[in-house]
Interface confidence: medium
């Protein structure tokens, strides 16, 4: 059964936590994805970023939870109109940006 | 307003025992990690230890493992520091402070006690 | 377990602009938070989580963290800002809270 929507933020929260938390080299190999815009639409564009990284199993458990967020299918090579223009960064400044973000609205307690 | 008062600081001879106590009000304590926090005399500040909001997890730092207990009472809105076999490099001013909570790692503490002096001396 | 390192002392005349440093091995990739401290009281946030701010804490604090090095900067300095100023991270490796060193702001 699906759960509340305050519990699955606060378990991707968690998941970030732990990615940045245990990081002892460059996540992902220093692979670099496109920046996103943080404000409306966050998970989908998080997703439509991240999932063009492949073969990093330290985020592909945060590619399922913010798979389960966004409401249509995402897919490889998909852009967002919430990417910023040309601007890539690496996944770990992405991921810690994301955790930062997501907690802000966890606070606020906005969970969709 | 939230707020926190330490107290049981004194001077105690090395080898002895003391227990501290911090007292929280104006926020719901039993959702929050509690810290403790030291600071001797013109130096730094020094991290002891935390006790996750439900008390279902302690963390101490080397220097007081084995030696220091940290327990919560969540009804009657108290942290407590339980020091054994003082030592004098112990001598130092202890702060409780709060700090939001997730499942892996605390937060910044936001709200912090006035402190309470305690001087390890023969 | 980890090390945060700080200069023990910055110096800035009132109405400039102060940077705090502090070092740690990929301290990019974790959350820093900043104190300031002045005598004989307790320790009040002025950064977390980086870059944010406690209501209360004025605009003219700020903070970012990349690569190896974490800053807190205070800009148009006035000499209510002397104090100790410190960082702190949670490491995972030792189940911990990490302070820095601590840095003495003086205003000239």
């Known amino acids: 059964s699906p759960v509340p929507p305050s519990t699955a933020l606060k378990e991707l929260i968690e998941e970030l936590v732990n990615i940045t938390q245990n990081q002892k080299a460059p996540l992902c190999n220093g692979s670099m994805v496109w920046s996103i815009n943080l404000t409306a639409g966050v998970y989908c564009a998080a997703l439509e970023s991240l999932i063009n990284v492949s073969g990093c199993s330290a985020i592909e458990k945060t590619q399922r939870m913010l798979n389960g967020f966004c409401p249509h299918k995402v897919s490889a090579g998909q852009f967002s109109s919430l990417r910023v223009r040309d601007t890539k960064i690496e996944v770990a400044q992405f991921v810690k940006d994301l955790l930062v973000h997501l907690k802000k609205l966890f606070r606020e307690g906005q969970f969709n | 307003q939230m707020q926190l008062v330490e107290s049981g600081g004194g001077v105690v001879q090395p080898g002895r025992s003391l227990r501290l106590s911090c007292a929280a009000s104006?926020?719901?304590?039993?959702?929050?990690?509690m810290h403790w926090v030291r600071q001797a005399p013109g130096k730094g500040l020094e991290w002891v230890a935390v006790?996750?909001?439900?008390?279902?997890?302690?963390h101490y730092a080397d220097s007081v493992k084995g030696r220091f207990t940290i327990t919560r009472d969540n009804s009657k809105n108290t942290l407590n520091l339980q020091m054994n076999s003082l030592r004098a490099e112990d001598t130092a001013v202890y702060y409780c402070a709060r700090a939001p909570q997730w499942e892996l790692t605390a937060e910044a503490f936001d709200i912090w006690g006035q402190g309470t002096m305690v001087t390890v001396s023969s | 377990s980890y090390v945060l390192t700080q200069p023990p002392s910055v110096s800035v005349a009132p109405g400039q602009t102060a940077r705090i440093t502090c070092g740690g091995n990929l301290i990019g990739s974790k959350l820093v938070h900043w104190y300031q401290q002045k005598p004989g009281q307790a320790p009040v946030l002025v950064v977390y989580d980086d870059s944010d701010r406690p209501s209360l804490i004025p605009e003219r604090f700020s903070g970012s963290n990349s690569g190896n090095t974490a800053t807190l900067t205070i800009s148009r300095v006035e000499a209510g800002d002397e104090a100790d100023y410190y960082c702190?991270?949670?490491?995972?490796?030792?189940?911990?809270?990490?302070f820095g060193g601590g840095t003495k702001l003086t205003v000239l």
């Open positions: 702190q991270v949670w490491d995972s490796s030792s189940d911990g809270v990490v």
């Open positions: 006790i996750w909001y439900d008390g279902s997890n302690k």
């Open positions: 104006g926020f719901t304590f039993r959702t929050y990690g």
